[in-house]
């Protein structure tokens, strides 16, 4: 069956090192787990994580992000899943695609991160 | 080097369980899942399921769901495979192979020798 | 379901000569299709993955092309080694594999 693709609907914001939690879901609503599940970022649609055929396709996911991103699924089975990545990043900022995919049906939403730093608020002098 | 060493052959009564064990060696057991595939005699290779060696998760195909069960024991690098209500279309080689995901793709890098269950009254 | 089918189901040849098979896909599998190879009594081997790239030790006179639907294994210059049955696979939705080429000695 068909779905939407629903991000948060605004920027998530997250401190330099801290982790960030991109949350995606599907609607209407239903079991994604048989499902492939992904973020990619332009330009070059980058792989940041991919779970396709019940796993993580760590092979596919770019270097940058290699043991940095965690696919959030304690509630895949109503098609909400989350984007955890850790240890943030400046060149993280920026736009990045969700999507689902059932068999050759696939539909995506964009989410915006916004990393601030800790200290920007210090007085060096 | 890697390698994969299953359980010798089989010879079951329809209804029955069998479980095949499949041993790795040459290289770190809980980095990389194990797939099990089977082989019908003078047939093609049919995909079973799926462990996480890791996490001890699972995903079954729909044809074996409720019948199979894929464990493991990290402490002997072994990864175990039952089936159950055993009939004589199960008569096959059963083939343990090791899960590439982490490093090259979604593929079998690595295959066991292969096990012959036999399954007849 | 996905269904992957291959052709021809035997394929007669001489060393030296060079192989085709075909591998078709029911649905467009993108690139996730790699290619085994079995012979008798043994195992099947990792040949090729994501429809092209030749995996370790796999010698060169291997090669695979396609994308989508369509996807072929070409071995050139066939040793006697090469004789053997192939299977295609694919993993872009769980897992299927065809139902082989038998690549026998003319």
């Known amino acids: 069956g068909q779905f939407r693709v629903i991000g948060p609907g605004h920027p998530i914001r997250a401190l330099v090192g801290d982790e960030a939690e991109l949350p995606c879901r599907i609607s209407p609503g239903k079991n994604a787990t048989g499902m492939e599940v992904g973020w990619y970022r332009s330009p070059f649609s980058r792989v940041v994580h991919l779970y396709r055929n019940g796993k993580d396709q760590d092979a596919e996911q770019a270097p940058e992000y290699r043991g940095r991103t965690e696919l959030l699924k304690e509630s895949i089975g109503e098609g909400k899943v989350a984007l955890r990545i850790q240890n943030v990043r400046f060149s993280d900022e920026g736009g990045y695609t969700c999507f689902f995919r059932d068999h050759s049906y696939q539909e995506e939403a964009a989410v915006e991160l916004k990393v601030e730093d800790p200290f920007y608020w210090i007085n060096p002098g | 080097q890697v390698q994969l060493v299953q359980s010798g052959a089989e010879v079951k009564k329809p209804g029955a369980s069998v479980k095949v064990s499949c041993k790795a060696s040459?290289?770190?057991?809980?980095?990389?899942?194990m797939q099990w595939v089977r082989q019908a005699p003078e047939q093609g290779l049919e995909w079973m399921g799926w462990?996480?060696?890791?996490?001890?998760?699972?995903s079954y195909a729909q044809k074996f769901q409720g019948r199979v069960t894929m464990t493991r024991d990290a402490s002997t690098s072994t990864a175990y495979m039952e089936l159950s209500s055993l009939r004589p279309e199960d008569t096959a080689v059963y083939y343990c192979?090791?899960?590439?995901?982490?490093?090259?793709?979604?593929?079998?890098?690595?295959w066991g020798q292969g096990t012959l269950v036999t399954v007849s009254s | 379901e996905l269904t992957l089918t291959q052709s021809p189901v035997t394929l007669s040849l001489s060393p030296k000569e060079t192989a085709t098979l075909s591998c078709r896909a029911s649905q467009s599998v993108r690139s996730y299709l790699a290619w085994y190879q079995q012979k008798p009594g043994q195992a099947p081997r990792l040949l090729i993955y994501?429809?092209?790239t030749r995996a370790t030790g796999i010698p060169a006179r291997f090669s695979g092309s396609g994308s989508g639907t369509d996807f072929t294994l070409t071995i050139s210059s066939l040793e006697p080694e090469d004789f053997a049955v192939y299977y295609c696979q694919q993993y872009s939705s769980w897992y299927t594999f065809g139902q082989g080429t038998k690549l026998e000695i003319k």
């Open positions: 462990i996480n060696t890791n996490t001890g998760g699972t």
């Open positions: 994501g429809a092209s």
């Open positions: 040459g290289y770190t057991f809980t980095s990389y899942g």
């Open positions: 192979a090791r899960d590439a995901t982490r490093i090259l793709a979604d593929v079998l890098d690595y």
